[in-house]
Interface confidence: medium
């Protein structure tokens, strides 16, 4: 087991004329993210296979708005490694493709929307463990620069992430056989359970006493490399550390194919066989079909059965796109009424209304009053989506069936006391206080704080409260 | 629904100014970058300005042959966008439109703008 | 500025047909286009945007394609309510700059 690493330096345009304009619109700003596909081996079915190595997206770069007018400059990076982990061997030979993505960040309803700017792919050896290998590939007017490794997880080591490692036994040094694993000096390989003479760099076994080989080698030991068609070509002279005869310059010499395609010779120039996606006479054109599953979220695609013929992707509800790659914010056209809140649901859009409204988009206002009586002679009032009973005196309550005790606020001060009356309250008022809640004091010279008792109630009586 | 209503079209002599408004409804008004486009027979539909949304600063573009002349600005609490239009000429007769959302997703009835002697 | 063109300024077709409308521009508008319907009584309607994303609203029959410099609106089975006049435009660059428009009728 282990982790394949892609650090991406740069996205721009690349060398010569026809510079592209910037990815974002005047209109729209946007920012880039990029996804790797990883395939095993080398082989021309490996490409149009899934990623069966692996895949990864990466986070989201920094928001780009064009300067109109203006060249496109190499656009800001999100942070970070991509990382692909695999389970098993590694393989040694793989295809990648890495695809930059642009996701505009206007106000369009919907939300964000991504789209696939630009599309490598390529074929490449690789031993895990090994330093990081530095690329740069084209597509159509823009660059990628990019940096990539296969590291193993502990307790995996080698080429392939094969060999395991445990703690050593013995604190001095490994047991017979046994060397140390480098880099980790303070462990011990351990014993090598593949078949005896199975080459550590070109073979592996997930079996005891297995050899199973690396692309590109065979042999019951690994030991022997594959022929290729170099190696079989009449041109030039042999090279004598491979026994391979040498090409001398051809039309395929230094791969005029993009993208990963292969070179074929032809009586008067060069044939280029392009991988699933890509087409043109070099292989510099991009034309995504539903072989490169360009369907987000479920989506089903239809079409697409040459390179260059357009895909439809059938969204699953709650998304929508060109690549089902939006989620379908429904709530966003506000579609409750009256200030009803707005659940999406997935399947289904659902209305939450307020009290007084109803319907599946709250858009029934309901009679507040209507076959609702106030008791007691109370009246209804509507309002806010609510009734309320506006009680008769001496009632309470929502529906004024609940006689009021207006003797429960105290309402009669300096100790007098209440009584409740059909109309109302009335206070007895303590010694030397007056008033309709005995909140005067009487004056030790008779007179009260009050200009005038009302006629009929001398200072002292109980004073009803009207 | 979304809904868009401009108003304030009408004849004017060539000189003079007009302000052209647009009631919006139906969706989140403060989102939403608003525009105005005009059509005319002469020259068909022509993109005249552009006003962003507050998390854009409400920034301001507008086509080389109004910049200096016309003035788009928004009031989010009234859910409005306002077109002033200063020294008109007989070339800035047309259908004034208004539309919403960056992809011009919305678009109103337009009211018409004369501009004649 | 960006000059989009729409060759074909009027289009006759029957009920049912397979119409297709293209537009052109002067240089690599990279996606950004949209179409419109505007009906006989002004009525403006966006169909698609980004080159290929349909609208909300609209049938599924309008769908758009192109890249680069060439884009083209489609419309798989007429009906009669798509009587109108069609247009594109660039929002690739300011200033956003529209087609001559596409007049479709019934034969």
């Known amino acids: 087991a282990g982790v394949f690493e892609l650090q991406i330096h740069s996205f721009g345009p690349g060398p010569g004329p026809g510079a592209p304009r910037s990815p974002c619109s005047a209109r729209l700003p946007c920012r880039l993210f990029f996804r790797v596909c990883l395939k095993p081996g080398l082989s021309e079915e490996a490409a149009e296979s899934p990623c069966a190595l692996g895949a990864a997206l990466s986070a989201r770069g920094p928001v780009y708005t064009e300067q109109p007018g203006a060249p496109a400059p190499d656009l800001p990076l999100p942070d970070g490694l991509l990382q692909v982990p695999f389970r098993d061997a590694w393989p040694g030979t793989f295809s990648f493709i890495i695809e930059t993505w642009r996701e505009e960040l206007g106000d369009q309803i919907g939300g964000p929307a991504w789209s696939l700017l630009a599309r490598v792919a390529g074929r490449r050896r690789l031993a895990a463990g090994g330093p990081w290998a530095r690329d740069i590939q084209r597509a159509g007017a823009w660059e990628l620069r990019f940096s990539y490794r296969a590291r193993c997880e502990p307790p995996a080591v080698g080429t392939a992430c094969t060999r395991l490692c445990r703690p050593r036994s013995a604190p001095s040094r490994c047991g017979p056989g046994l060397r140390p694993c480098a880099p980790l000096e303070d462990e011990c390989e351990a014993p090598l359970v593949c078949r005896a003479g199975c080459s550590p760099e070109h073979g592996f076994c997930e079996q005891p006493g297995e050899c199973r080989c690396l692309e590109g080698w065979t042999g019951p030991l690994c030991t022997v490399p594959v022929s290729t068609s170099s190696c079989l070509s009449p041109r030039g002279p042999s090279s004598a550390t491979t026994g391979c005869l040498v090409p001398g310059p051809g039309p395929c010499d230094g791969n005029p194919c993009a993208n990963g395609g292969s070179c074929s010779e032809t009586p008067r120039s060069f044939e280029c066989t392009c991988p699933r996606g890509f087409y043109g006479l070099r292989c510099e054109v991009s034309g995504v079909t539903c072989a490169d599953g360009p369907c987000f979220n479920g989506g089903l695609c239809v079409g697409g059965a040459d390179p260059d013929s357009a895909y439809i992707c059938h969204c699953p509800p709650g998304f929508q796109g060109s690549n089902c790659e939006k989620r379908v914010d429904r709530c966003s056209l506000q579609p409750c009424r009256n200030g009803g809140l707005c659940l999406d649901l997935g399947h289904a859009l659902r209305c939450r209304c307020r009290a007084g409204f109803a319907g599946p988009r709250c858009e029934h206002d309901l009679d507040d009053c209507a076959g609702r009586a106030c008791a007691n002679g109370g009246t209804c009032v509507e309002g806010g989506g609510a009734h309320r009973c506006s009680c008769a005196l001496g009632f309470g309550g929502r529906d004024c069936r609940e006689r009021a005790d207006p003797c429960a606020a105290r309402p009669c001060a300096h100790g007098g006391r209440c009584y409740a009356h059909f109309s109302g309250l009335v206070c007895a008022c303590a010694p030397g206080y007056m008033g309709a809640r005995c909140e005067f004091p009487v004056h030790p010279d008779g007179a009260s704080a009050l200009p005038a008792a009302p006629p009929g109630l001398r200072p002292g009586d109980p004073q009803r409260y009207l | 629904e979304v809904k868009l209503e401009e108003s304030g079209g009408g004849l004017v002599q060539p000189g003079e100014s007009m302000k052209l408004s647009c009631a919006a409804s139906?969706?989140?008004?403060?989102?939403?970058?608003m525009d105005w486009v005009r059509q005319s027979p002469e020259k068909g539909l022509e993109w005249v300005a552009e006003i962003r949304n507050k998390a854009n600063n409400h920034a301001t573009y507008y086509a080389e042959s109004v910049k200096g002349k016309f003035t788009i600005s928004r009031d989010d609490s009234k859910s409005r966008v306002y077109l002033q239009m200063n020294n008109l000429r007989a070339a800035d007769t047309g259908i004034y439109y208004c539309?919403?959302?960056?992809?011009?997703?919305?678009w109103g009835q337009g009211t018409l703008v004369t501009v004649s002697t | 500025d960006i000059q989009m063109t729409q060759t074909t300024s009027s289009l006759s077709a029957s009920l049912g047909d397979r119409v297709t409308i293209s537009c052109r521009a002067s240089q690599n508008i990279i996606n950004y286009l949209n179409w419109y319907q505007q009906k006989p009584d002004g009525t403006v309607k966006l169909l698609i945007y980004?080159?290929?994303r349909l609208h909300s609203g609209v049938p599924s029959r309008f769908s758009g394609s192109g890249s680069g410099t060439d884009y083209s609106l489609t419309i798989s089975n007429l009906e009669p309510e798509d009587i109108a006049t069609y247009y594109c435009q660039q929002y690739s660059e300011r200033p956003y700059t529209f087609g001559g428009g596409t007049k479709l009728e019934i034969k």
């Open positions: 539309t919403a959302y960056s992809n011009f997703a919305y």
């Open positions: 980004y080159t290929s």
């Open positions: 139906g969706f989140t008004f403060s989102d939403a970058w």
